[in-house]
């Protein structure tokens, strides 16, 4: 979509084990009300309140890992748009299904 990005980043995914998987609530931030973002959660994809990022435009060191395989989803959601939206040393990289925050590989 041509819309500008919503502020903040998705909250970190809880490490709890999922007992019941939920059908996805959204496919992009723009299908979420207000400031909420479309985010991966323990048991599916939900509209969640974002958390702030200190410097969203900063590029982080390292390279994005190469991804293999084909995404079976039409218009997969992006869970980030730039490195600064990712926690710690994680980078915003294109994966098999949309962009997400992943550990970089050494350049």
């Amino acid at each position: 979509s041509g819309k500008s990005f919503k502020a903040g980043v998705c909250p970190p995914k809880k490490s709890a084990q999922c007992l019941r998987y939920k059908k996805p609530e959204c496919q992009s931030d723009w299908q979420c009300p207000g400031k909420k973002r479309c985010c991966p959660d323990t048991c599916g994809i939900k509209c969640l309140d974002p958390v702030d990022t200190p410097n969203p435009t900063r590029r982080k060191p390292g390279k994005c890992p190469v991804t293999y395989g084909q995404c079976l989803m039409l218009n997969p959601p992006n869970f980030c748009e730039m490195d600064g939206q990712c926690k710690r040393d994680l980078k915003c990289c294109m994966g098999m299904c949309g962009k997400s925050c992943v550990s970089p590989v050494k350049a």
Epitope: K23, Q27, P33, K36
Partner: antibody, heavy 122, light 108 residues
């Protein structure tokens, strides 16, 4: 018991916006636990899922219709609505509203409205 | 999107006989498959979900089986009220949810 009832104009002119409302009784949309869908059936044809909305207002649309579809919810009236823009004769169909559980193990659409025929014609 | 293909398009069966309807998915949908019955001028009615679980109030003569890409709906002994169109629908992984084109069960 749970009931869904579609309402809206039965005739829409080409290039205009089709607007339908589904009124739900017997269960509160705002209590959560369900996705509320719109599904259409072209005359003498099969079924096409348009999209769904959650009580919070989050939506998921069929990519084939995404650019023209808006689904909204009014929990105070226990209603959800469909808007389909830039309609053509190919959008003539019976439109159903339906309910499905939010979890995969709850399966398909367990309650449906009776359907309303919308004809696109000048 | 996942394409659902039903066969046959029309099934002619005598009352009291068994009817077997098939549904094939273009890729695996696990057990996330539902079956519906639709009569003329009516909305579809949920018969089976999770590929094999009967919905509330559905008679035991309706049964579903299969997983992955191949599914079957069996009506063990057709009653007069069972003559209708039957649709399968997948709800696996990501929307869009998709339906088969339908199988019409008619009186032989």
């Amino acid at each position: 018991q749970v009931q869904l009832q579609e309402s809206g104009p039965g005739l829409v002119k080409p290039s205009q916006t089709l607007s339908l409302t589904c009124t739900v009784s017997g269960v509160s949309i705002s209590s959560g636990g369900y996705y509320w869908s719109w599904i259409r059936q072209h005359p003498g044809k099969g079924l096409e899922w348009i999209g769904y909305i959650y009580y919070s207002g989050s939506t998921y649309y069929n990519p084939s219709l995404k650019s023209r579809v808006t689904i909204s919810v009014d929990t105070s009236k226990n209603q959800f609505s469909l808007k389909l823009s830039s309609v053509t004769a190919a959008d003539t169909a019976v439109f159903y509203c339906a309910r499905e559980g939010e979890y995969y193990d709850e399966g398909g659409f367990d309650y449906w409205g009776q359907g309303t025929l919308v004809t696109v014609s000048s | 999107e996942i394409v659902m293909t039903q066969s046959p398009a029309t099934l002619s069966v005598s009352p009291g006989e068994r009817a077997t309807l098939s549904c094939r998915a273009s890729q695996s949908v696990s057990s996330n498959l539902a079956w519906y019955q639709q009569k003329p001028g009516q909305a579809p009615r949920l018969l089976i979900y999770g590929a094999s679980t009967r919905a509330t109030g559905i008679p035991a003569r309706f049964s579903g089986s299969g997983s992955g890409t191949e599914f079957t709906l069996t009506i063990s002994s057709l009653q007069s009220e069972d003559f209708a169109v039957y649709y399968c629908q997948q709800y696996n992984n990501w929307p869009p949810w998709t339906f088969g084109q339908g199988t019409k069960v008619e009186i032989k």
